[in-house]
């Protein structure tokens, strides 16, 4: 239904707290360099204006669209051109072009310092002094670093943060209470960020149809007892929610997500038997819980997929009558039978099925042609299964750090032109798949591994798009989203690459490395490893292991030495010489 004032409508639906949080996220995601105080001022002005519209929907400007209102606010910021360069040109445009322009200027890799967590005491003090400001800072800092973070989900993580601080700041040992809990939230939020970015990429590059197909597969796996009409309704609603969030319409997105959660809880009987626990929770927790609810039990009496999609004489007729509906039912039926497959794999199978029908239905004897389609799925299924087995075996053998290093070597060989920081970040993230997925039961490994890898590789593609340097990466990133991971896996050593010349300073270290936290130490070592591979792309695993073991020994020795500086300055050059010899 149309509302006289959109801003009043959203304020009423969401309530002041969520309204303010979402406006802050929106501004922080659009203008990523502004300080918290600048954004907080704008948020307060927008909120005060929304309240005047609630009081009188006919008041001046209350009938304007949210894009117009928010865009006007952003464009009124002083020194916009000095701070944001060509983004200021967006302000010369009219809506909806202005908003599109803002979206295009979102930076997936802003040059902001890492979000450092303050020391426990200081955190608790500022939290107690002003919890609202404290949480505002959290929303601002996360949103500006992750301009596509799913806004209603970020409110959920802020709520989690709040609960942890409330609990731990009352403890005697605040540090040991806060650290593991906040680390857990951070890890989940980072995964949520790359997953959502993948959804927005799908929407931006391939449109709503592609996202809806993803949603149908995912929902069919989770709710195998829901009928196709129900799954289609949920997928359509979920597509709308994600389209809004990816498009910067955060108030509409959060409002529609709350509506979807409400609908699901009111229709549990036709959706799933597993929703009740989620539905008993308050809004943010409820929506979060529903998004990762366990799969319902599969119906026992499902007929073989071949009956309707291979053996039926009507296949081509049904396909001709409504291509998208027929392919949608195929995806639904296949997905509900395979919670053990990744969504990417299911979409590849649906694509193969579509290509088979396109070819076979044009033949004189279609059934003879498409009769073998299910057998043709086999290699497509085996490939990711082998990937999971090989990688999980390697992870179990090497542990997370060693596994990350193996991936780093592999990916540096595939795309040595990519910057070392990007390769290290990618390898560290890809390597976490072991800890995240390889410990799961067998039937959950494949969906966990492949869908996580796809999301991480999407980030690799986004970073590479900014400064394309590798033809290998460009090739894999320009295809369809579901083909990316197999494409990257199939890449081998880039034979066109001219090895980097050996620079001693790249492998020269100082005593300051000794005081770094373990994570930072690992990054330094992994940076050196990537540089070694760039110098010798065809070095064997044994050669690289010898060098890295020597390097680790050197760090251990010098960091334990009484005179660290002298140790580093005398032993360092020896290490460099040994490295060159080992790789000769």
């Amino acid at each position: 239904e149309a509302h006289k004032s959109e801003i009043a409508h959203r304020y009423n639906d969401l309530g002041e707290q969520h309204f303010k949080g979402l406006v802050l996220i929106a501004f922080s995601q659009y203008l990523q360099k502004c300080s918290y105080d600048e954004h907080a001022k704008l948020v307060q002005e927008v909120t005060d204006f929304a309240k005047t519209c609630v009081a009188d929907e006919s008041a001046a400007n209350c009938d304007k669209s949210l894009h117009t209102l928010f865009g006007d606010k952003l464009c009124a910021i002083p020194n916009l051109r000095e701070n944001y360069g060509e983004l200021a040109d967006c302000c010369t445009k009219q809506e909806p072009e202005r908003n599109e322009c803002f979206l295009q200027h979102k930076d997936d890799n802003p040059s902001l310092p890492p979000f450092e967590r303050p020391e426990a005491e200081a955190m608790c003090t500022s939290f107690k002094e002003n919890p609202t400001t404290f949480m505002g800072h959290y929303l601002h800092e996360v949103a500006r670093r992750h301009p596509y973070f799913y806004a209603p989900e970020l409110l959920y993580y802020a709520e989690q943060y709040n609960e942890i601080l409330t609990q731990c700041c009352a403890e005697a040992d605040k540090e040991s209470c806060l650290t593991p809990k906040l680390d857990g939230v951070k890890e989940k939020a980072l995964v949520s960020s790359v997953r959502q970015r993948m959804k927005c990429s799908s929407m931006q590059k391939f449109g709503e149809r592609a996202f809806k197909a993803w949603a149908v597969a995912r929902l069919s796996q989770t709710f195998p007892n829901a009928d196709f009409a129900e799954i289609t309704k949920l997928a359509t609603d979920l597509t709308k929610v994600n389209k809004e969030c990816c498009h910067g319409d955060l108030l509409e997105c959060a409002d529609d997500r709350a509506e979807l959660a409400k609908y699901m809880c009111e229709n549990q009987a036709t959706i799933s038997s597993k929703l009740q626990t989620c539905c008993d929770k308050p809004l943010l927790k409820k929506a979060h819980c529903l998004s990762e609810v366990e799969h319902d039990t599969m119906p026992a009496d499902l007929p073989a997929i071949a009956a309707d999609f291979v053996e039926d004489q009507e296949v081509c007729k049904n396909y001709a009558e409504a291509k998208d509906v027929f392919l949608g039912t195929f995806l639904y039926e296949y997905s509900r039978r395979h919670p053990d497959y990744s969504v990417s794999l299911l979409l590849r199978l649906a694509k193969k099925y579509e290509a088979t029908l396109e070819k076979c239905c044009a033949e004189a004897n279609p059934p003879a042609c498409y009769g073998t389609v299910l057998a043709e799925f086999q290699p497509l299924v085996e490939e990711p299964k082998n990937l999971v087995k090989t990688n999980c075996d390697l992870y179990e053998k090497l542990g997370e750090y060693g596994f990350q290093n193996a991936i780093l070597v592999r990916y540096t060989q595939k795309a040595p032109q990519v910057s070392t920081p990007t390769l290290v970040e990618a390898a560290r993230n890809l390597g976490r798949v072991g800890t995240k997925c390889c410990t799961l039961p067998e039937d959950q490994r494949l969906p966990c591994v492949e869908d996580y890898l796809s999301a991480i590789l999407n980030r690799v593609c986004l970073l590479h798009e900014k400064t394309p340097v590798s033809e290998h990466v460009t090739k894999c990133c320009s295809g369809s989203l579901v083909e990316r991971r197999p494409c990257f896996s199939a890449l081998t050593v880039d034979e066109t690459y001219v090895p980097k010349e050996f620079k001693a300073e790249t492998f020269t270290f100082h005593s300051d490395i000794c005081t770094l936290p373990e994570k930072e130490k690992q990054i330094k070592k992994q940076t050196a490893l990537a540089e070694l591979v760039k110098h010798k792309p065809k070095a064997t695993a044994e050669q690289l292991k010898t060098v890295m073991d020597d390097f680790a020994q050197f760090l251990d020795t010098c960091c334990k030495a009484a005179d660290k500086d002298t140790c580093f300055s005398t032993e360092g050059p020896n290490l460099v010489t040994r490295c060159k010899d080992a790789l000769a």
């Epitope: 004489q313 001709a320 396109e358 239905c361 004189a364 279609p366």
Partner: nanobody, 115 residues
Framework: KVQLVESGGGLVQPGGSLRLSCAAS????????MSWVRQAPGKGPEWVSS????????LYADSVKGRFTISRDNSKNTLYLQMNSLRAEDTAVYYC????????SSQGTLVTVSS
């Protein structure tokens, strides 16, 4: 909505000829193989002939081979069946179908071969 409308049937003497047409709409005609299927009174459906989307490949049931010719005009979205040397056993309702379907989803056209 997919629609198939057959025409051209009628009463013909044994040894005579008829040309059946099937006007198709609601789908990309040239992307689909098409078939003619017939059903004699009190019998089940019987496949007669098929043609690929481009018209380059054709298949015939042994009972009509050498007598019937299937063709199509993709510019007119029309399928044809030229029937020569008709026999009494060719009497049936003839339907055009998409792909390899034997199930009629249209009215069909009646062909009666009788002296």
């Amino acid at each position: 909505k997919v629609q198939l409308v057959e025409s051209g049937g009628g009463l013909v003497q044994p040894g005579g000829s008829l040309r059946l047409s099937c006007a198709a709409s609601g789908f990309t005609f040239s992307s689909f193989g098409m078939s003619w299927v017939r059903q004699a009174p009190g019998k089940g459906p019987e496949w007669v002939s098929s043609i690929s989307g481009s018209g380059s490949d054709t298949l015939y049931a042994d009972s009509v081979k050498g007598r019937f010719t299937i063709s199509r005009d993709n510019s007119k979205n029309t399928l044809y069946l030229q029937m020569n040397s008709l026999r009494a056993e060719d009497t049936a309702v003839y339907y055009c179908t998409i792909g390899g379907s034997l199930r009629a989803s249209s009215q069909g056209t009646l062909v009666t071969v009788s002296s």
